[in-house]
Interface confidence: medium
Amino acid sequence: GYKAEVMVSQVYSGSLRVLNRHFSQDLTRRESSAFRSETAKAQKMLKELITSTRLGTYYNSSSVYSFGEGPLTCFFWFILQIPEHRRLMLSPEVVQALLVEELLSTVNSSAAVPYRAEYEVDPEGLVILEASVKDIAALNSTLGCYRYSYVGQGQVLRLKGPDHLASSCLWHLQGPKDLMLKLRLEWTLAECRDRLAMYDVAGPLEKRLITSVYGCSRQEPVVEVLASGAIMAVVWKKGLHSYYDPFVLSVQPVVFQACEVNLTLDNRLDSQGVLSTPYFPSYYSPQTHCSWHLTVPSLDYGLALWFDAYALRRQKYDLPCTQGQWTIQNRRLCGLRILQPYAERIPVVATAGITINFTSQISLTGPGVRVHYGLYNQSDPCPGEFLCSVNGLCVPACDGVKDCPNGLDERNCVCRATFQCKEDSTCISLPKVCDGQPDCLNGSDEEQCQEGVPCGTFTFQCEDRSCVKKPNPQCDGRPDCRDGSDEEHCDCGLQGPSSRIVGGAVSSEGEWPWQASLQVRGRHICGGALIADRWVITAAHCFQEDSMASTVLWTVFLGKVWQNSRWPGEVSFKVSRLLLHPYHEEDSHDYDVALLQLDHPVVRSAAVRPVCLPARSHFFEPGLHCWITGWGALREGGPISNALQKVDVQLIPQDLCSEVYRYQVTPRMLCAGYRKGKKDACQGDSGGPLVCKALSGRWFLAGLVSWGLGCGRPNYFGVYTRITGVISWIQQVVT
């Protein structure tokens, strides 16, 4: 019998250029008579154009919703009712070709053509894109608050904020032909629930979404987004009601930046330069294509690419890469944003060099990508260290910490976290190396103590990049480096002339002169430690709640002992900058460190002095008794302490602690405490210092109070941010 044909709605969006009309400001106001009159004419023309082609039989509805420059650009959508079996045949490309063919056929025709009665449509300026019913609904919901802006070359246009009576607004942005638009979004409030979506076309087409941002992101307080061309749309959806705009939007046209380069690398190891997507740190644009050709001076070397918070992964099957596609020597890899460093090592087998391509495969983009490039020795990629094949990084080997996710850096160690005697491979405690007393059979622990040695896990790297054998030589009163750099920056770590943490005792004035109290509205929230004249270090999780993210809330007290009273040695500061570690992850507590820049430098006194920062190679030996200090609760769930408490805790081997916490302990963590519990940090101690005394009498910062199960519970140690694991970031910020 007769079976009705199944019809489906196919939605298209697009724009066309009218050559015999000019854009005027009246056309930006939907309520103006000019807008109403122009849309009526344009709509009639659009319908006539479509129905003049064989698409006419499928025509359902259409709408012109906006105008722009060029001389006059009309933005529209239309719906065709198509038999289901023809759906794929009428792709946007086919529909565009049919409409262009129709326009071209009448360009030189003298016959009266209805759609040409008023408008001279440019066939080359017609664009047809795929859309959906959902896209049209999203567009219609913004039309009560629709703003069109044209931004000229060399201009930076600050966009007017949204209409807070509306629930959704759309900024339709256009720039000069052949340029690309760069949108800058700056969040101005600490917390909000507003959502902003940026599109690579004039309307909110889901398939052309560049990115969407939500809720006053602290991770990205400023976001710069590039369109692939001169048109862009930004849609705002209201969050919580607010009289203040939680963001500032500005837009500017920029020229296309070529992303192609030919480089010849020098005959040296380490980083030699940087490659980045155009306008880094802006988000890369939806049609980015970069091609970098690097020539390596010799086959002894391989090429290393060092990424920051971005990794390359093999993509199973042939799925598109959602965070950038890379091709390196014909290998296809997908980019992936991660909260870790990563290196891609490319073995070089021919002198022709290496070509690296980066492409944004889909319209959805992300933060610009930057990569440091350099050479490594193919026969010894990590001198004195271990090459972690999982992430391409060189990590310390046999130091008692599994730095590589697969733990291979701690496998097959003859001597773990100890010194291996040359003579018979016996292992001796690190403090016994270069201490003036031979402990190895033929005294190999005391050899080469006055000269440079190859750099390794426990060697100290001097400023001139040479290494010394003596472990932990910093600030011990004896210059070990040729350039004396091990004895520089040593005005630290000394206690003042001093006369609760769970299981602790009260501290005296000047006993812990680096201890900081971080307060909000007069209430102690977290501990911290002074590490430089204008910098205090603390835990990132202290700022986890959006309401705690603003610098203006915080006051830092130094030289304090009692919470409920002040004494002459105590000083307070406002915070001018707050920096969380870029890899900090709230759920895992990884990289739990933050730096606060004080509004003015400290004046050092007996009660206010910085603690010493360890070098990356500094070894804090398990079993060592160190100290934690703070005003935290004296018992689990209790109130904070009035007096600054101190307690000694023992450093715990990493794998023992990792076992207790079911392998949630990362290489950036360090454990301390006792199996019996009792002595531990507690709520309110977070961010406070774990310090260990060196033989020189100076105190070094080993950790920051981070997390743990309860307080002082048997079998559960306190977990601290391992300072040696984040020291390079600290030094980069502070210096």
């Epitope: 008692g400 773990r416 976290a417 100890t418 292992c427 001796i428 405690s429 690190l430 016994k432 030996e621 398990p622 079993g623 023992q650 715990i652 081997p653 990493q654 794998d655 023992l656 405490g673 006792y674 199996r675 019996k676 009792k678 048997p714």
Partner: antibody, heavy 118, light 107 residues
């Protein structure tokens, strides 16, 4: 100075029980574990178990489970180890030793010889 | 339980000699290993803990090394008072276990 003073030698018949005491001085017993280790003549050291004097929590080696009981009286800084159902192979010197949390046993008592003989 | 194996069972040496005693754990004990000295009729005395840390009051001729499963006690220059039995013990997890001992005798 730190000292652990143990009770005197005992001679017991098979099937009987023995209770050895260990009195601490020079430190707070509640800050440490008290471990019990035994050594049969000419043999090595064997860990029997330990008690946390602060809360009385105990941990025993599987071999002694059900036969050993460790108790304490913090008011007199004393820990006790009672071993029941004695057999001739329990003849040994019994030592108490303190340990701080994760560290090994740093101070030991002088030992108490327990002889099990019919 | 973690088994501790010491070698050799006994060793003969002279005053001034360098002596090495080894201890192997049946599983990884990180650096949680101690060495004790025991003389006839006396209680054991702690020499080394955490594999390499010298207990206060112990002469520096005693040193410990190793990590994981293999450990060494070294006496760099034997003195007459060093002739005794030496035990290793893991303090990584309970039940704590000892090696069977190494008797150091005068040659």
């Amino acid at each position: 100075q730190v000292q652990l003073q143990q009770s005197g030698a005992e001679v017991k018949k098979p099937g009987a029980s023995v209770k050895v005491s260990c009195t601490a001085s020079g430190f707070n017993i509640e800050d440490y574990y008290i471990n019990w280790v035994r050594q049969a003549t000419g043999q090595g050291l064997e860990w029997m178990g330990r008690i946390d004097p602060e809360d009385g929590e105990t941990g025993y080696a599987q071999k002694f489970q059900g036969r050993v009981t460790m108790t304490r009286n913090t008011s007199i800084s004393t820990a006790y180890m009672e071993l029941s159902s004695l057999r001739s192979e329990d003849t040994a010197v019994y030592y108490c030793a303190r340990s701080i949390y994760l560290d090994p046993m740093d101070y030991w008592g002088q030992g108490t010889l327990v002889t099990v003989s019919s | 339980d973690i088994q501790m194996t010491q070698s050799p069972k006994s060793v003969s040496a002279s005053v001034g000699d360098r002596v090495t005693i080894t201890c192997r754990a049946s599983q990884d004990v990180t650096t949680a290993l101690a060495w004790y000295q025991q003389k006839p009729g006396q209680s054991p005395k702690l020499l080394i803990y955490w594999a390499t840390s010298l207990q206060s009051g112990v002469p520096s001729r005693f040193s410990g090394s190793g990590s994981g499963t293999d450990f060494t006690l070294t006496i760099s220059s034997l003195q007459p008072e060093d002739f005794a039995t030496y035990y290793c013990q893991q303090h990584y997890s309970t039940p704590y276990t000892f090696g069977q001992g190494t008797k150091l005798e005068i040659k």
